[in-house]
Interface confidence: low
């Protein structure tokens, strides 16, 4: 018995060959002997029932002269899975058709971190194995249900699932979109008084949802809400905002948050949550603030916010050797010389932040 694998919604070609390689009488039947179609000697295709009942069934007239009499079944349904009989030259050829379907759980748009389940629907009597390959080449194998946990942004794209049955295979392509922020964490390095802008681009255009930025200043031991907002038809509206910050949220996507003037007290870390119909996305936000000030006879450079232990704070007169350089968050120079001083926050040879101050004369207070 010949086996043919098909995909729901597509077409299958069931073979039937004559040994004489020429046109001959043939008939295709269901296993219950109901006639589907055939050719009875006049080169005309005769259908076994009404056109509406048999319009999905066809043959390839062009192949008849070569002794080939295939049965074409279009718009395949799961219930087309059965045995078909081709009668020609006083013999019967049996062809088994199995129609398969692969579907993704609930939706093909999933959030980063969620699980993807691919399910194979198969006809009774079949014993398929499934192997699915992600856009990145990741291979997963199994029976009729396959699961991938902790989806990553890079899992977006076309997943190719190969159904294997009796050494034959059929391929399915499923487009999966992993919804995510385009970066895992954002850090802004700013001098006191500057404005800070955070942009949160998504890898998709989300129509509706709501979000909140919870913030924990370095000096605080708890998170507090800074701003809450909603997204409707790609428009962003502020619901609540901390008044003393004068936060500005752009009205259009991508989500863009601006702090007009940062100060040391704002430095810290935040967590932006965006709640959509499908679940919640998280984005880490960090703000590092630098302040250089001269008070009495001392020049101080201070940094607050989440810095790494490898970061170095350097206070020096411009175009001169470093006066103070420490792996800590505050550096001071007593009785600084008059002139332009700069404070640098660096990691290795990469400068993260640079703030300058003009020292006019010793003992003058200025910030």
């Amino acid at each position: 018995k010949t086996l043919v694998l098909g995909k729901e919604g597509e077409s299958a070609e069931l073979p039937c060959e004559s040994s004489q390689k020429k046109i001959t009488v043939f008939t295709w039947k269901f296993s219950d002997q109901r006639k589907i179609l055939g050719q009875h000697g006049k080169g005309v295709l005769i259908r076994g029932g009404s056109p509406s009942q048999f319009d999905r069934f066809d043959s390839k007239k062009g192949a008849w002269e070569k002794g080939s009499f295939p049965l074409i079944i279009n718009k395949l349904k799961m219930e087309d899975s059965q045995t078909y009989i081709c009668e020609l030259e006083n013999r019967k050829e049996e062809v088994e058709l199995w129609v398969f379907k692969v579907t993704a759980n609930s939706d093909t748009h999933l959030l980063q971190g969620q699980s993807l389940t691919l399910t194979l629907e198969s006809p009774p009597g079949s014993s398929p194995s499934v192997q699915c390959r992600s856009p990145r080449g990741k291979n997963i194998q199994g029976g009729k249900t396959l699961s991938v946990s902790q989806l990553e942004l890079q899992d977006s794209g076309t997943w190719t699932c190969t159904v294997l049955q009796n050494q034959k295979k059929v391929e399915f392509k499923i487009d999966i979109v992993v919804l995510a922020f385009q970066s895992t964490a954002i850090t802004a390095y700013k001098s006191e008084g500057e404005s800070a802008e955070f942009s949160f681009p998504l890898n998709f255009a989300e129509e509706n949802g709501w979000g909140e930025l919870m913030w924990k200043a370095e000096k605080d031991s708890f998170f507090q809400p800074w701003i809450s907002f909603s997204i409707k038809n790609k428009e962003v509206s502020v619901q609540k905002s901390t008044k003393d910050l004068k936060l500005q949220l752009k009205e259009t996507l991508p989500l863009t948050l601006k702090i007009p003037q940062v100060s040391l007290q704002f430095a810290g870390s935040g967590n932006l949550t965006l709640t959509l119909d499908k679940g919640t996305l998280h984005q880490e936000v960090n703000l590092v603030v630098m302040k250089v000030a001269q008070l009495n006879n001392t020049l101080t450079c201070e940094v607050m916010g989440p810095t790494s232990p490898k970061m170095r704070l350097t206070l020096k007169q411009e175009n001169q050797e470093a006066r103070v350089s420490e792996e800590q968050k505050v550096v001071q120079v007593v009785a600084p010389e008059t002139g332009l001083w700069q404070c640098l926050l660096s990691e290795g040879d990469k400068v993260k932040m640079d703030s300058r101050i003009q020292v006019l004369s010793r003992g003058v207070n200025q910030t």
């Epitope: 390959r133 992600s134 990145r136 080449g137 990741k138 291979n139 902790q150 990553e152 942004l153 890079q154 977006s156 794209g157 190719t160 385009q182 895992t184 890898n203 998709f204 255009a205």
Partner: antibody
Framework: QVQLVESGGGLVKPGGSLRLSCAAS????????MNWIRQAPGKGLEWVSY????????FYTDSVKGRFTISRDNAKNSLFLQMNSLRAEDTAVYYC??????????????????WGKGTTVTVSS | EIVMTQSPAALSVSPGERATLSCRAS??????FAWYQQKPGQAPRLLIY???TRATGIPARFSGSGSGTEFTLTISSLQSEDFAVYYC?????????FGQGTKLEIK
């Protein structure tokens, strides 16, 4: 700057084992998918294996399946390739490479942009 | 496995002239396609990804085109440092595969 440095290559007899290492620096190693690619003397390039950023997703080319094992230690910024049951046809320069991605009009494009200088593996009796 | 076929195997061109290298995939790879340059004793260097996007730091004289199964790398005005072996690469299906290489020589 971004750097990948392979080590662990050498001369080994057929059936022997070697463990290649790749030390990464200048970038957040745990954010990137990593790969091993090889090049036999005077020949073209062949993809050997890749591993996801988390280390959960691993794939090998057919010729090394069951013999080679790719792994990573994100805490130590290191990528490894354990090669067992080595054959003469495994003789090659082995490159460690980082897979990058860029986005354009909401689509993501992947490419292997950063390569190490390579380490030579010779399998001979 | 997708087979990548490069032509010609070798190409002799004078400095300042244009060079055109071709690559054909045995099946569609869409735009998941790259070109690499390799000099003796060195690792491959990415020139083009996504079929036509120049990698960071690659001069504008290098350009890629094509989609599906037919791809072209054009070097508009050859410099002495451009003489090397060029590989095409598909990353649509695993295993990722390379062409056999085209050696670009000084005429």
């Amino acid at each position: 700057q971004v750097q990948l440095v392979e080590s662990g290559g050498g001369l080994v007899k057929p059936g022997g084992s070697l463990r290649l290492s790749c030390a990464a620096s200048g970038f957040t190693f745990s954010d990137y998918y990593m790969n091993w690619i090889r090049q036999a003397p005077g020949k073209g390039l062949e993809w050997v294996s890749y591993i996801s950023s988390s280390g959960k997703t691993i794939f090998y080319t057919d010729s090394v399946k069951g013999r080679f094992t790719i792994s990573r230690d994100n805490a130590k910024n290191s990528l490894f390739l354990q090669m067992n049951s080595l054959r003469a046809e495994d003789t090659a320069v082995y490159y460690c490479a980082r897979e990058d991605y860029s986005n354009y009009e909401d689509y993501y494009y992947y490419y292997t942009g950063v390569w190490g200088k390579g380490t030579t593996v010779t399998v001979s009796s | 496995e997708i087979v990548m076929t490069q032509s010609p195997a070798a190409l002799s061109v004078s400095p300042g002239e244009r060079a055109t290298l071709s690559c054909r995939a045995s099946q569609s790879v869409s735009s998941k396609f790259a070109w690499y340059q390799q000099k003796p004793g060195q690792a491959p260097r990415l020139l083009i990804y996504n079929a036509s996007t120049r990698a960071t730091g690659i001069p504008a004289r290098f350009s890629g085109s094509g989609s599906g199964t037919e791809f072209t790398l054009t070097i508009s005005s050859l410099q002495s440092e451009d003489f090397a072996v060029y590989y095409c690469h598909q990353y649509k299906n695993w295993p990722y595969t390379f062409g056999q290489g085209t050696k670009l020589e000084i005429k």
